[in-house]
């Protein structure tokens, strides 16, 4: 004969646990139904009546099967430097992520607590490591034979053009100026993508970034020596 199916609420066998989507109510000492995502427990179960669930109100949610008396509040609206990548619904919290050109300097469980603008490498410096959603740009000085004349969070050091006759030699922040009308480009433009520039002058090489034990979520951008606009908090 098939085992008899117990309907909630029911007293569990000694030593056994309640089934999936049920919880043990200490007061009633019964296995009772949990509420589904998007709902909460309006009335707790008794020995004779099961949990009464109700839908979450606007701007509140429950993501899991639960028996909480109140739904959780959705986070505040996304700040100006963030975009809403997941809306607040009865079943899920709002998620804010940093908008393009920014990265998450301080993360929270879901989304970002502090967004900050990606570092812009000044002329003479190029991007050694691009920014990501959770890490800032890393800049490096342009090695001999390469240059960057922009202030940019994306531009790498590019090779100087090779001239038949040089009018003005290039440097780290300026391309070479040729007198001839048909300059040729440098042989190995791919070299500028290397994290450590290859250089014949050892004093001009930049150390390869070394990994460290610190978390890889961070930053912001100083404008002069005063503190930068401190990014924004999205709670």
């Amino acid at each position: 004969l098939p085992a008899q199916v117990a309907f909630t609420p029911y007293a569990p066998e000694p030593g056994s646990t309640c089934r999936l989507r049920e919880y043990y109510d200490q007061t009633a000492q019964m296995c009772c139904s949990k509420c589904s995502p998007g709902q909460h427990a309006k009335v707790f179960c008794t020995k004779t009546s099961d949990t009464v669930c109700d839908s979450c109100e606007d701007s509140t949610y429950t993501q899991l099967w639960n028996w909480v008396p109140e739904c959780l509040s959705c986070g505040s609206r996304c700040s100006s430097d963030q975009v809403e990548t997941q809306a607040c619904t009865r079943e899920q919290n709002r998620i804010c992520t940093c908008r393009p050109g920014w990265y998450c300097a301080l993360s929270k469980q879901e989304g970002c607590r502090l967004c900050a603008p990606l570092r812009k490498c000044r002329p003479g410096f190029g991007v050694a490591r691009p920014g990501t959603e959770t890490s800032d740009v890393v800049c490096k000085p342009c090695a001999p034979g390469t240059f960057s004349n922009t202030t940019s969070s994306t531009d790498i050091c590019r090779p100087h053009q090779i001239c038949n006759v040089v009018a003005i030699p290039g440097n780290a922040s300026m391309d070479a100026v040729c007198t001839s009308t048909s300059p040729t480009r440098s042989m190995a433009p791919g070299a500028v993508h290397l994290p450590q520039p290859v250089s014949t002058r050892s004093q001009h090489t930049q150390p390869t970034p070394e990994p460290s034990t610190a978390p890889s979520t961070s930053f912001l951008l100083p404008m002069g020596p005063s503190p930068p606009a401190e990014g924004s908090t999205g709670d």
Partner: antibody, heavy 121, light 107 residues
Amino acid sequence: EVQLVESGGGLVQPGGSLRLSCAASGFAFSTYDLSWVRQAPGKGLEWVAYINNGGISTYYSDTVKGRFTISRDNAKNTLYLQMNSLRAEDTAVYYCVRGPFYGSANYFDYWGQGTLVTVSS
Amino acid sequence: DIQMTQSPSSLSASVGDRVTITCRTSESIYSNLPWYQQKPGKAPKLLLYDATKLAEGVPSRFSGSGSGTDYTLTISSLQPEDFATYYCQHFWVTPWTFGQGTKVEIK
């Protein structure tokens, strides 16, 4: 108000270890690159180590490379300098400094009050 | 490594004097040069950055000039509170070295 407060200095024997800490407040810690700079008694300034805001990039002076490790805890707003295999020439006041925002704003704009490390037998 | 040669190592001057300190680098540092002031027993303080830009709260009697490998800090009219040691520094490739310092003393 930006504040950087170093701690952990003291007297240590040659070959010993010490860990310096720097508690930061008054700014968005996780968005700034940080460094350690030292000054031997009666001498000039010497840059020691740098860590970028996310802890991805660390650079060291040749005099401490392989012996010192810079790290940070952005959740605790704290910068660290683990100093191993200490030598007499490491005796100095160690300053925790904010900056450089390397490649973009190249300077040290705030300095702690310093903590004295003395390496002597 | 980039060598920083700061001169003079010390100088004596009177209140109201114009004071000039120079810093020469062994290769171009593209104006990635700050100047700091340090008083005895105190931490250094940023005076100028990018060779010529005045840091916040620094009096206008301080000025900087230079490019490439040659840089100058000028105090147009020395004040009693300016007696201190001054350091230049480069932020080109690592290691980021400081000049050896210039001590400005009262004549």
